[in-house]
Interface confidence: low
Amino acid sequence: VNAIPDQCSPLPCNEDGYMSCKDGKASFTCTCKPGWQGEKCEFDINECKDPSNINGGCSQICDNTPGSYHCSCKSGFVMLSNKKDCKDVDECSLKPNMCGTAVCKNIPGDFECECPEGYRYNLKSKSCEDVDECSENMCAQLCVNYPGGYTCYCDGKKGFKLAQDQKSCEAVSVCLPLNLDTKYELLYLAEQFAGVVLYLKFRLPEISRFSAEFDFRTYDSQGVILYAESIDHSAWLLIALRGGKIEVQLKNEHTSKITTGGDIINNGLWNMVSVEELEHSISIKIAKEAVMDINKPGPLFKPENGLLETKVYFAGFPRKVESELIKPINPRLDGCIRSWNLMKQGASGIKEIIQEKQNKHCLVTVEKGSYYPGSGIAEFHIDYNNGSNAEGWHINVTLNIRPSMGTGVMLALVSSNNTVPFAVSLVDSTSEKSQDIVISVENTVIYRIQALSLCSNQRSHLEFRVNRNNLELLTPLKIETISQEELQTQLAILDKAMKGKVATYLGGLPDVPFSATPVNAFYNGCMEVNINGVELDLDEAISKHNDIRAHSCPSVWKKTKNSEDQVDPRLIDGK
C-alpha cells in the first residue's frame, strides 16, 4: 500500500490567513490567524460589522483591513491613546487669528468665523462686511441700510405706515370716522391761510346805500368777516370779530371810526348779522336787535357819475389795507356764513361761484377745536429759552387730542439741519383698537405710552415737561422708557439742538428725511396745543396748510359702540 502523502504540502491554507497546517489522514486542518476564517483561512473577518462589538469599538470611523481593522477620526478630530476614541480639535485655540476680525467659534470637527447680525464673513479679507439688505429688496417702499442692519420706512405723508412685519407698508386707517359733510350754501371763510375767499364788485344806482345781511357761525375770536371799499380806495368799511364781538372800522373823507359791541358771538351757533347804512348812521344788528349805531356825517361811499361802485371782500382785505386800519387785526377767521344778502341784491352770483368749489364749502356741523386733516402742518417759531430759569430752555406741553387716524406726528421740533430733536407722535398699537403715544429724540423712541384707546368721542389729555435734565409725564399712564443713562444721552442731543434754532410744527413734519423720526405721517384729527402756558392759535402760525381748520373741528360721524368709546381716564381732558 502506498503511503498517503503529507496533505499540508503543498500548502492548502491561505498564506495570509493561516497560522499553521496540520496533516491528517487524507485531510488537513488550517488554523487561522486572528481576523481570518474559513477552511483554508481564506476569508477576512470584518471586525467593523461584528454585532458583538459594534463598529469595532471605534467612536467614529472603523476601517476593516485584511485580517485586521483600525479606528480613525473624522477631519477636525484627533485619536486618543486608546486608539478607539476621537477628540474634537479646538482650531480656534490652536491657530490664533484664524478668522481675522471676526469671532472664531469652535464647532465639532470644525470652526466657524462668526459675524454680528447684519454682517457677512469675507474669506478673502478675513473680516466682517456689512450686508446691504436694501439691495435685496427687503422693503416695500423705502429702505435705509446702516452698518449691521437696515430699516424700512413708508411714506407717511402719502398715508402709509409700516406694517407689523416691519417691511411692508399699509394705509393708515381711519379709527374714528368724522362727519365731513359740507354744503355749498355755506361759505367757508378760512379757505385760504392768507388771502381773500371771495371778491365781488357792485355797480348800483347812486341812491343805493351799503348793506350786508348774513348768518354767521364761528368759534374763532378774531378775524375779518367782510371788507368793503369804494372803487378808488378812498373810503372803506371793515366788519370783523375781536374778542368774539363784532367790530366795525370805517374810514371816508368825513370820518374815521372804530366801534365794538354786542354780545360775544363766537359760540359756534348761527348768528344773524346785519350791517345797514342809514341816512345818518350805520346800524349793526345781531338777531334783528340793534347792537351798534355808528354816526356818520355823509354817505359811506361817494357815488360817481350816477353810480355807486363798491368792492366787497370776504374773509380778508387787500394787502395794502393793513397799514390803513385804525386798529390792526389778524384777518384770519375760521367761520362760515350763509343766507347772505349784499347791497340788497340777494345771493346773486355768489352761490354760483362757490357751488363748484368744494374747498369753499363749509362743514354742516362743527365743534370747538382745531382740525388737522392729515394733509399738512402748521409752523410756529417759539422761544423755549427762559432767562429766569436756571435749567435754560424748557418745554411744557399740554395736548388735547381726538384723533381720527391712529398714526401721525402731533408735535415736532425741527432743527435748521433738518433733524428732529423732539417729536410726539401717535402710532397704532399692536393691540387691537388702541394707540401708543411715542416721544422721540431724532430716531430714538425715549418714551412709549402703551395701548391707549384714543380714537374715541372723548378728548384725551396729555401733559409733559422737558428740560435738559428730565422728561416728566404729568398724566398718569403706564409707560415704557429707555434706561436713565440712555435717556440722558438723548436729552443731551435735544439740549444741543435747543441751543440752536428750532421751529415748532404741529400736525406733522416738513420735508425731512424719512429716517429722521420713527413716525412721519401727518396727524389726522382734532388737537389743541398749549406750550409753556400759551394756547397756540393756528391763526397766528408762521404758515399753515389751508386744509387745517384753526377753530373748528368736525363732529364724530356716528356714536361708536360703548366698548369702542373708552379712553384711558387718565387722559380725559376736563378743560
Epitope: Q458, H461, K478, I479, V567, P569, D573, G574
Partner: antibody, heavy 119, light 106 residues
C-alpha cells in the same frame, strides 16, 4: 389677589409727626402707582398724595393742603409705601386709606388707619 | 380744580323703588367714577367710565350722563344697596371727589 394693609395711625398732638405705612401684595409693586386718600366727616374723601412707579422715577404729587408737610415714599424691596406727616393740624384728623392707582384711578383700597390730631 | 356737587346729600327709598342720585361737574367731556362705601369699610369702585359696572356689581345699577350732570340709578332698591355713594372725576391733579349721597332704606 390685591391686598393693601395700612398701619401707624394713632393719637398725636398738633405740631407733631407721624408715619403711616402700607404693605402691599398681589401685584407687581415696583410698577404700581400708589396713593393716600383721607376721609373725615368735615371734608369727606380727600386725595392726599401719590407716588409713581419705577418707570416714572418715583415722581411724587401732593394736594395743596399737605404740600411741604407730608412726604410720600416707597420701598420696592418691601412692597411698601409710606406717608411721613409733619406739622400736623387738627384738620388732618381722619381715616387714611392706602390706594393702588390703576387705569380706573382708585381701584383698590386698604381698610384704613385712623389718625387723631388733638391736644 | 373740578368741584363735584352731589345731590341729594341724604335720601331714603323703599325696597323695589327706583333711585336716582346726581353729580354735577364742570365738564361733559370727562368720564365719571362712582364709589360705594358702607360703614366701617373703605370705599369701593362701583361704576367706571360713566356707565360701566365693576365686576360683581348687580345689574340693577346703572350710570349715565346728560350734559355736565351725571347720574347713578338703581332700578329697584334692595336693602344691601343702603350705603354712601361718592362720585369722582379726573382732570389732572388734584383728584377730586363729590361730597357723597347717603342712601338709606325706608
Amino acid at each position: 389677589e390685591v391686598k393693601l394693609e395700612e398701619s401707624g395711625g394713632g393719637l398725636v398732638q398738633p405740631g407733631g409727626s407721624m408715619k403711616l405705612s402700607c404693605a402691599a401684595s398681589g401685584f407687581t409693586f415696583s410698577d404700581a402707582w400708589m396713593g393716600w386718600v383721607r376721609q373725615s366727616p368735615e371734608k369727606g374723601l380727600e386725595w392726599v398724595a401719590e407716588i409713581r412707579g419705577k418707570a416714572n422715577n418715583h415722581a411724587t404729587y401732593y394736594s395743596e393742603s399737605v404740600k411741604g408737610r407730608f412726604t410720600i415714599s416707597r420701598d420696592d424691596s418691601k412692597s411698601s409705601v409710606y406717608l411721613q406727616m409733619n406739622s400736623l393740624r387738627a384738620e388732618d384728623t381722619g381715616i387714611f386709606y392706602c390706594c393702588l392707582i390703576t387705569a380706573f384711578l382708585f381701584d383698590y383700597w386698604g381698610q384704613g388707619t385712623t389718625l387723631t390730631v388733638s391736644s | 380744580q373740578i368741584v363735584l356737587t352731589q345731590s341729594p346729600a341724604i335720601m331714603s327709598a323703599s325696597p323695589g323703588e327706583k333711585v336716582t342720585m346726581t353729580c354735577s361737574g364742570r365738564s361733559s367731556e370727562n368720564y365719571m367714577y362712582w364709589y360705594q362705601q358702607k360703614p366701617g369699610s373703605p370705599p369701593r369702585l362701583w361704576i367706571y367710565d360713566t356707565s360701566n359696572l365693576v365686576s360683581g356689581v348687580p345689574a340693577r345699577f346703572s350710570g349715565s350722563r346728560s350734559g355736565t350732570s351725571y347720574s347713578l340709578t338703581i332700578s329697584s332698591m334692595e336693602a344691601e344697596d343702603a350705603a354712601t355713594y361718592y362720585c369722582q372725576q379726573f382732570n389732572g391733579y388734584p383728584y377730586t371727589f363729590g361730597g357723597g349721597t347717603k342712601l338709606e332704606i325706608r
